[in-house]
């Protein structure tokens, strides 16, 4: 058993039929010695008396809020949560496996630049009685600070018969050094509690590997005289690290016909303009990627050819 | 060339070669790795890999103030990786083709380090490890890990030279 936060405890249980469970001793936080009784949740049934209560925790019915009282007055509470270990593996019932970039990916994170700010998100089909708490650090043995906000519900989607809920959190490295070569990964730890079930999820990454720039901005076309060619120009996204002479992007320009089957023409350039042939009903799209490190491409920014 | 006394390197040449290094490093090991990131060895092990750290003056402001600290650090890393790519980790079994991206990478690391430091002037360099694995599959695993680290190192070096070429070239 260990303390998650004040008056909230996690009991780790090997979860199999007829498992013996864990013996837990609860102590009432009071100077009182006599006349103390214990109850569980909203029940008025007295479970025991005395300053300590010994219970055998085997299943979710044994978890919950234990309260010690004296003469009708509440003295203190202890909330017991269960963390299930099935066949040697901690349960992952609360979050959905996103399966990208590999199986058992429950947390996904992205950064728009090298400032040390990043966003992580996760999915669940659970809609109520759900809380998350996020901690992060750079490195684990001598951790350096990363501050995370509160996790918030960021999207709801319908997937077949199920509703899927996306939660996200923003974190910021306290003393970020955008120009340095990372040698220690960022660690992200999410505590998830659904009713009386506790689970934890972790992710480990370098900022450089989760970079995904915003799409290029101000995408414009300038027809060239007496030609089917146009000059496409764009700018670095506002969210990208500066100066751009240091934090450079490379770009992919694509001409795409109305039909997905039509051949796509692609040009790669380090400049913020390119000359392409604009076909009727086609559109021109541009996306960006770090010039020197092959992390993710941005989403496309597009304009119609007409 | 960065000569003793601190004159400027050939920023544009360095920019071109460092950008080529980035391309080669990714063609040598194209996977964006999902290797285990925690490189925790056992009790007595030390991490000897030269990283470009926060205090090395490789940020835009540091380069403007005095680029020598940063160039020295980059040179140290280039020599370290050049020696690694020439070591039995890469020359042993399983063999690489003579014109493989790793061979080109090795030559380009040497080329860039020579651009930064002319003959006769020596910055201190890091020793490469002596305890070498005996098995081909151990070497293969280390090659992946070394190339992943090299990708990160040359990316920072390329940013430095791009910025230098744009803002510090005479």
């Amino acid at each position: 058993i260990w303390e998650l936060k004040k008056d909230v405890y996690v009991v780790e249980l090997d979860w199999y039929p007829d498992a013996p469970g864990e013996m837990v001793v609860l102590t009432c936080d009071t100077p009182e010695e006599d006349g103390i009784t214990w109850t569980l949740d909203q029940s008025s049934e007295v479970l025991g008396s005395g300053k300590t209560l010994t219970i055998q925790v085997k299943e979710f019915g044994d978890a919950g809020q234990y309260t010690c009282h004296k003469g009708g007055e509440v003295l203190s509470h202890s909330l017991l949560l269960l963390h299930k270990k099935e066949d040697g593996i901690w349960s992952t019932d609360i979050l959905k496996d996103q399966k990208e970039p590999k199986n058992k990916t429950f947390l996904r994170c992205e950064a728009k630049n090298y400032s040390g700010r990043f966003t992580c998100w996760w999915l669940t089909t659970i809609s109520t009685d759900l809380t998350f708490s996020v901690k992060s650090s750079r490195g684990s043995s001598d951790p350096q600070g990363v501050t995370c906000g509160a996790a918030t519900l960021s999207a709801e989607r319908v997937r077949g018969d199920n509703k899927e809920y996306e939660y996200s959190v923003e974190c910021q490295e306290d003393s970020a050094c955008p120009a340095a070569e990372e040698s220690l990964p960022i660690e992200v730890m999410v505590d998830a509690v659904h009713k009386l079930k506790y689970e934890n999820y972790t992710s480990s990454f370098f900022i450089r590997d989760i970079i995904k720039p915003d799409p290029p901005k101000n995408l414009q076309l300038k027809p060239l005289k007496n030609s089917r060619q146009v000059e496409v120009s764009w700018e670095y996204p506002d969210t990208w690290s500066t100066p751009h002479s240091y934090f450079s992007l490379t770009f992919c320009v694509q001409v795409q016909g109305k039909s997905k089957r039509e051949k796509k023409d692609r040009v790669f350039t380090d400049k913020t303009s390119a000359t392409v042939i604009c076909r009727k009903n086609a559109s021109i799209s541009v996306r960006a990627q770090d010039r020197y490190y092959s992390s993710s491409w941005s989403e496309w920014a597009s304009v119609p050819c007409s | 060339r960065a000569v003793p006394g601190g004159s400027s390197p050939a920023w544009t040449q360095c920019q071109q070669l460092s950008q080529k290094l980035c391309t080669l490093a990714w063609s040598a090991h194209p996977l964006v790795g999902h290797m285990d990131l925690r490189e925790e060895g056992d009790e007595e092990t030390t991490n000897d890999v030269p990283h470009i750290q926060c205090g090395d003056g490789c940020d835009p402001q540091g380069l403007r103030d005095n680029s020598q600290f940063c160039l020295q650090r980059i040179h140290q890393g280039l020599i370290f990786y050049e020696k690694l790519l020439g070591s039995d980790i890469f020359t042993g079994e399983p063999s690489l083709l003579p014109d493989s991206p790793v061979a080109q990478l090795h030559a380009s690391l040497l080329g860039l380090s020579q651009l930064l430091q002319p003959e006769g002037h020596h910055w201190e360099t890091q020793q490469i490890p002596s305890l070498s694995p005996s098995q081909p599959w151990q070497r293969l695993l280390l090659r992946f890990k070394i190339l992943r680290s090299l990708q990160a190192f040359v990316a920072v070096a390329a940013r430095v030279f791009a910025h230098g070429a744009a803002t510090l070239s005479p």
Epitope: - | D42, D48, P133, W137, L141, K145
Partner: antibody, heavy 127, light 108 residues
């Protein structure tokens, strides 16, 4: 704390196959490399092969090549060793063992020395 | 294959005495690639020494390893009751990674 827990004893007929499992609990399975070592009754130790980690294929001792298959399932943190065409001289205790991590510069790699062992699985081959 | 020959096959000593176990290789083994294990009846082996002379985590200081090339030694400076067991050397220089046949340290 990582622990390696192996499947129970097996009695097999000559010519058949046996599949022994080894479950790692605690720690990061993907960074652990599991070898298989056997010990015939009253005899010494014999290395059979190593299960694939990230980026490597299974690697076998020549003696067992073609008869042994070593696999790993990262999702269940379990390594498996399957030995086919069993004969009486395959009667032994089969151990899974984790490679100690060596360091080359700043990069870890598995040494072929074993710092954590399963409890062993006795496989008896008898007609 | 590299053959490792351990001697003596059995060593009879009393608690408090010094034990010297030998492991000889049929061809040169880099000292980076030699390990020693302890095994008690009914138990799995336990790594004691790796890289010929480095003690594994939690191994008492009375165990020490030395040697290079073809001759390696495991020394137990003062035998404790729990040290009576069989000891194996192992080379990882060449495949197959071979073990010696073992030295049994028994109470005299």
């Amino acid at each position: 704390q990582v622990e390696l827990v192996q499947s129970g004893a097996e009695v097999k007929k000559p010519g058949s196959s046996v599949k022994v499992s080894c479950k790692a609990s605690g720690g990061t399975f993907s960074s652990n490399y599991i070898s298989w070592v056997r010990q015939a009754p009253g005899q010494g130790l014999e290395w059979m092969g190593i299960s694939p980690g990230t980026g490597i294929n299974a690697y076998y001792a020549q003696k067992f090549q073609g008869r042994v298959t070593i696999t790993a399932d990262e999702s269940t943190s379990t390594a498996y060793m399957e030995l086919s065409s069993l004969r009486s001289e395959d009667t032994a205790v089969y151990y899974c063992a984790r490679s100690k991590k060596g360091m080359y510069g700043g990069w870890t790699y598995p040494l072929m020395m074993f710092d954590l062992w399963g409890q062993g699985t006795l496989v008896t081959v008898s007609s | 294959d590299i053959v490792l020959t351990q001697s003596p096959a059995t060593l009879s000593l009393s608690p408090g005495e010094r034990a010297t176990l030998s492991c000889r290789a049929s061809q040169s083994v880099s000292s980076n690639y030699l390990a020693w294990y302890q095994q008690k009846p009914g138990q799995a082996p336990r790594l004691l020494i790796y890289y010929a002379s480095r003690r594994a985590t939690g191994v008492p200081a009375r165990f020490s390893g030395s040697g290079s090339g073809t001759d390696f030694t495991l020394t137990i400076s003062s035998l404790e009751p729990e040290d009576f067991a069989t000891y194996y050397c192992q080379q990882t220089s060449n495949t197959p990674f071979t073990f010696g046949q073992g030295t049994k340290v028994e109470i005299k």
